[in-house]
Interface confidence: low
């Protein structure tokens, strides 16, 4: 079936990093820089992605294989293979489109990206807080009330400011 | 009449390096990527690593990717490769090729002999 | 890395014999094998390219066939300008790497 299939089509003989050029008499030609072809048999060379403003190079394009992009200091990758870079905050905020917004009381991000995220329910579980949740940290669940001794006091947040998983608008 | 010309000899001592030189004619230089390949007296071949002429880009077999550099010099369609710290391993033949498939095009190679 | 393993070393024919030289992938590299001539003193030439297509100029007694880890270079009729090594090499995968080559001398 192979042999068939080259006699049909000679560009199938052409490997990665060449294209098939029907200029050419279809001889396999290399693909010219800034091109590659990660397959055989192809009938064009595909352009190397550029790597450029808020993108860096991770790995340089080849002839058979296309660039790969991340992005500058205080941005992270967004998107398969990195098609987008975005901002980074601080931890103990979210990135709105105003710009990085501090967390709303009884909500945490403990990373540069991502939204923040409601303290998690002690009460919820029968527990009482053991620590109190920051900014930049959720609270630190311990035993149920029940285990405290006489006097002490438990604190639960107030009902979060959105739902969990809700992004910014 | 594509032509890929290296000079044929270099004598150099161990720990030094050398700049290998292939200056290229009869084509658009940058239309390919220029590939380096040694060998030693009466064995095979061995790919060091290829340089996107338009660009600069390169590619290096991790063996050589700390002694080996590879560099472009469009203005006169020259491209280079330095290797450093030679040792008697390197006395070798090296030539620069555009070597990916077809068309193929070999220099007539550099002959390297490190000896003190 | 992807290793090329050629077998035999040498062989020594007669002009006008069947020459069969072979080269082993150690992992599946398609159809993305080329094989050289290297005569005496003289740098590499292009031979086949794509395991099995004729570079341009190459008389048709030079045939290339094989896929993904065998392939295997065969000179119908041997001629005595054919006394060279024989050198077969991948451009699948990085690094591009080379056999160690066949030594073909004529009797």
């Known amino acids: 079936f192979e042999r068939t299939r080259s006699l049909q089509d000679p560009c199938s003989n052409c490997p990665a990093g060449t294209f098939c050029d029907n200029n050419r008499n279809q001889i396999c030609s290399p693909c010219p820089p800034n091109s590659f072809s990660s397959a055989g048999g192809q009938r064009t060379c595909d352009i190397c992605r550029q790597c450029k403003g808020v993108f860096r190079t991770r790995k340089e394009c080849s002839s058979t294989s296309n660039a790969e992009c991340d992005c500058t200091p205080g941005f992270h990758c967004l998107g398969a293979g990195c098609s987008m870079c975005e901002q980074d905050c601080k931890q103990g905020q979210e990135l709105t489109k105003k710009g990085c917004k501090d967390c709303c009381f009884g909500t945490f991000n403990d990373q540069k990206r991502g939204i923040c995220r409601p303290w998690t329910n002690c009460s919820l579980d029968g527990k009482s807080v053991l620590v109190n949740g920051t900014k930049e940290r959720d609270v630190v669940c311990g035993p149920s009330p029940a285990d405290l001794s006489p006097g002490a006091s438990s604190v639960t947040p107030p009902a979060p400011a959105r739902e969990p998983g809700h992004s910014p608008q | 009449q594509v032509q890929l010309q290296q000079p044929g000899a270099e004598l150099v001592k161990p720990g030094a390096s050398v700049m290998l030189s292939c200056k290229a004619s009869g084509y658009t230089f940058t239309s390919y990527w220029m590939h380096w390949v040694k060998q030693r007296p009466g064995q095979g071949l061995e790919w060091i690593g290829e340089?996107?002429?338009?660009?600069?880009?390169?590619n290096y077999y991790e063996k050589f990717k700390t002694r080996a550099t590879l560099t472009v010099d469009k203005s006169s369609s020259t491209a280079y490769m330095q290797l450093s710290s030679l040792t008697s391993e390197d006395s070798a033949v090296y030539y620069c090729?555009?070597?990916?498939?077809?068309?193929?095009?070999w220099g007539q190679g550099t002959l390297v002999t490190v000896s003190a | 890395n992807i290793v090329m393993t050629q077998s035999p070393k040498s062989m020594s024919m007669s002009v006008g014999e069947r020459v069969t030289l072979s080269c082993k992938a150690s992992?599946?590299?398609?159809?993305?094998v080329s094989w050289y001539q290297q005569k005496p003193e003289q740098s590499p030439k292009l031979l086949i390219y794509?395991?099995?297509n004729r570079y341009t100029g190459v008389p048709d007694r030079f045939t290339g066939t094989g896929s993904a880890t065998d392939f295997t270079l065969t000179i119908s009729s041997v001629q005595a300008e054919d006394l060279a090594d024989y050198h077969c090499g991948q451009s699948y995968s990085y690094p591009f790497t080379f056999g160690s080559g066949t030594k073909l001398e004529i009797k």
């Open positions: 992992d599946n590299v398609g159809i993305s």
């Open positions: 340089i996107n002429l338009r660009n600069g880009g390169t």
């Open positions: 090729t555009i070597l990916t498939s077809a068309p193929s095009y």
């Open positions: 794509g395991a099995s």
